[in-house]
């Protein structure tokens, strides 16, 4: 058993049917010695007496809030959370994994050291999250994260809707122009009722870069059905742009065609590569769509920015 | 070609070649996170790789002040990787076909490092470690690690040359 925060303890339990359970000693935080009784929010009536209560924890009924009393007065509380281990593997039941098998998905719109991580939950009830740097070595990268918040968007996976939580983090000391040598390491602690789980992720900022879409897409008519399409770097992208350059993929989207945001990289069929911020295209109905990607490192592509082909004359 | 002393390299040529290096490095190992290579035993070969760090003057301001520190660092790295790509790590099994991007990558690393070598001026180069893993498994793992590391290195180098070509070319 270990202390998660004041008066909250995590009991690591072997979740196999014949496991003996964990023996836990709870000590009442009081100078008093006599006439102390114990209750649990999971069971009726008095469950023990004495300054120290010894219990065996093997199921969720054994978790929860334990309170010691004397003569009708509450002396102290100890909250027990269960961390299940089945066949040597810690449980991962609170979160739902994304398509690529990861539980935490982090993205950064630039190289500033600011990034956002998100995760999906199976049931949005009685949840608490805490995310922090997981590496304690002196040369590790320190990160400060805010509070997790529930996103407005729901995510559908395998025909089921999941709630999405997000958190913003910032690396304490950054050097956007350097080559990263140590990954950022994060741990997410998740609590749901009396269940505790932890999840971890490790990444370089360069691998989680996903630029915002190009902005200010515009059309200028040329001869025949040729148009010049132009755009600008997204505001959030690192500067100077002569150093932090983007490349762009341009595609004609036919009417009624959906633009797929693929996991498998940017260069979809029919898209062509442009390094400047304008190009000429043949455009007869539908949309012209542009997406951005770091010019020198193949991290994720931005979402598509699209503009209709018809040009107001 | 770069000229002696503290003068500038051919920024535009370096930009082109470094961008080609980026493309080749990704062709040689396109899969991001295809195995979590950080989990595997850290080989000294990948630990000793020269990195472009914060104090190396490869940021826009540092390049404006004196690009030589940064260029020297980049050249050291290019020579290091060029030696690795020519070693048994890449010539042994698993077999690479002659059309492999690794061959072109190897030649381009050499080409760019020569562009950065001032006439009659030889920067000291780092000692290249030469552990030769005996098993295909270890060799392949090391290959992937080296290529992932090279992708990060040449991305920074390409940014440096792009910025130099845009702002420091005569």
């Amino acid at each position: 058993m270990w202390e998660l925060e004041k008066d909250v303890y995590v009991v690591e339990v072997d979740w196999t049917p014949d496991a003996p359970g964990e023996t836990v000693n709870l000590t009442c935080d009081t100078p008093e010695e006599d006439d102390i009784t114990w209750t649990s929010d999971q069971r009726h009536g008095v469950i023990g007496s004495g300054k120290t209560l010894t219990i065996t924890v093997k199921e969720f009924l054994d978790a929860g809030q334990y309170t010691c009393h004397k003569g009708g007065e509450t002396l102290s509380h100890s909250h027990l959370l269960l961390h299940k281990k089945e066949n040597g593997i810690w449980s991962t039941e609170i979160l739902k994994n994304f398509k690529n098998k990861t539980f935490l998905k982090c993205e950064a719109p630039n190289y500033s050291g600011r990034f956002t991580c998100s995760w999906l939950v199976q049931r949005n009830m009685d949840l608490k999250f805490n995310i922090k740097s997981s590496s304690s070595s002196p040369d590790s990268r320190a990160v400060t994260c805010g509070m997790a918040s529930l996103s407005a968007e729901k995510v559908t996976l395998d025909q089921r809707d999941y709630e999405k939580y997000s958190v913003s983090c910032q690396e304490d000391v950054t050097c956007p122009t350097a080559e990263e040598t140590l990954p950022i390491e994060l741990a997410l602690e998740a609590r749901q009722q009396n269940k505790y789980e932890n999840y971890s992720t490790s990444f370089f900022i360069r691998d989680i870069i996903k630029p915002d879409p190009p902005k200010n897409l515009q059309m200028k008519p040329l001869k025949n059905s040729q148009v010049e399409v132009s755009w600008e770097y997204p505001d959030s992208w690192s500067t100077p742009h002569s150093y932090f350059s983007l490349k762009f993929f341009v595609r004609i989207q036919r009417k009624k065609e959906k633009m797929k945001e693929t996991e498998e990289g940017c260069n979809q069929k029919g898209a062509f590569l442009v390094e400047k911020t304008s190009t000429e295209v043949q455009c007869k109905g539908g949309n012209v769509c542009v997406q951005a990607q770091d010019r020198y490192y193949n991290s994720s592509c931005s979402k598509w920015a699209c503009v209709p082909c018809r040009v107001r004359s | 070609r770069a000229v002696p002393g503290g003068s500038s390299p051919a920024w535009a040529q370096c930009q082109q070649l470094s961008q080609k290096l980026c493309t080749l490095a990704w062709s040689a190992h396109p899969l991001v996170g295809h195995m979590d290579l950080r989990e595997e035993g850290d080989e000294e070969t990948t630990n000793d790789v020269p990195h472009i760090q914060c104090g190396d003057g490869c940021d826009p301001q540092g390049l404006r002040d004196n690009s030589q520190f940064c260029l020297q660092r980049i050249r050291q790295g290019l020579i290091f990787y060029e030696k690795l790509l020519g070693s048994d790590i890449f010539t042994g099994e698993p077999s690479l076909l002659p059309d492999s991007p690794v061959g072109q990558l190897h030649a381009s690393l050499l080409g760019l490092s020569q562009l950065l070598q001032p006439e009659g001026h030889h920067w000291e180069t780092q000692q290249i470690p030469s552990p030769s893993p005996s098993q295909p498994w270890q060799r392949l793992l090391l290959r992937f690690k080296i290529l992932r590391s090279l992708q990060a290195f040449v991305a920074v180098a390409a940014r440096v040359f792009a910025h130099g070509a845009a702002t420091l070319s005569p």
Partner: antibody, heavy 120, light 107 residues
Framework: QVQLVQSGAEVKKPGSSVKVSCKAS????????IHWMRQAPGQGLEWIGY????????KYNENFKGKVTITADKSTSTAYMELSSLRSEDTAVYYC?????????????WGQGTLVTVSS | DIQMTQSPSSLSASVGDRVTITCKAS??????VAWYQQKPGKVPKLLIY???TRHTGVPSRFSGSGSRTDFTLTISSLQPEDVADYFC?????????FGSGTKLEIK
Amino acid sequence: QVQLVQSGAEVKKPGSSVKVSCKASGYTFTDQTIHWMRQAPGQGLEWIGYIYPRDDSPKYNENFKGKVTITADKSTSTAYMELSSLRSEDTAVYYCAIPDRSGYAWFIYWGQGTLVTVSS
Amino acid sequence: DIQMTQSPSSLSASVGDRVTITCKASRDVAIAVAWYQQKPGKVPKLLIYWASTRHTGVPSRFSGSGSRTDFTLTISSLQPEDVADYFCHQYSSYPFTFGSGTKLEIK
């Protein structure tokens, strides 16, 4: 898109030779190796060898040395595989294929196959 | 030459079944193994490379695993269109070699 089109089926007498062609399109012919495999009726696949058209250098499976000659014609983007001193055991479907661009020999694109039958 | 010993040589399973085909290399090939599907009268089609990476467009019911000498192709839920021959292939060492194949049929 990448396409490999092979020549038609052949029936040959024992002791004779056959030359199978594989015309490539949809990519730069000199950029990639072209490999040849064979599959005898009801059997698995055997790798015969490859040619790298950029420098016309072939590499053979030792088991086929002296039996097979692989060549390439850059002007027509065509690879050839010639089998000599044919025997009944050479009856098989012969495939040309090109591998992935990363330089490892897993095969993404295959020709449609050419059946060579050796019979007296 | 590296021998790729594939088993079983044939198997019959019902739609929805989980099907496993194994391949054993006679020496270490790292993860330089690919799997192909060949339907009757058709050319082989790449399913898996690097032992476990699915090729573009291959349904997610196909998965590969293994390293060094022992490799597995798994079809998590057999579909009627999966009737075919399946081959493993090592591309670690010359000459590249293939398994003898597994003929998969529906019961």
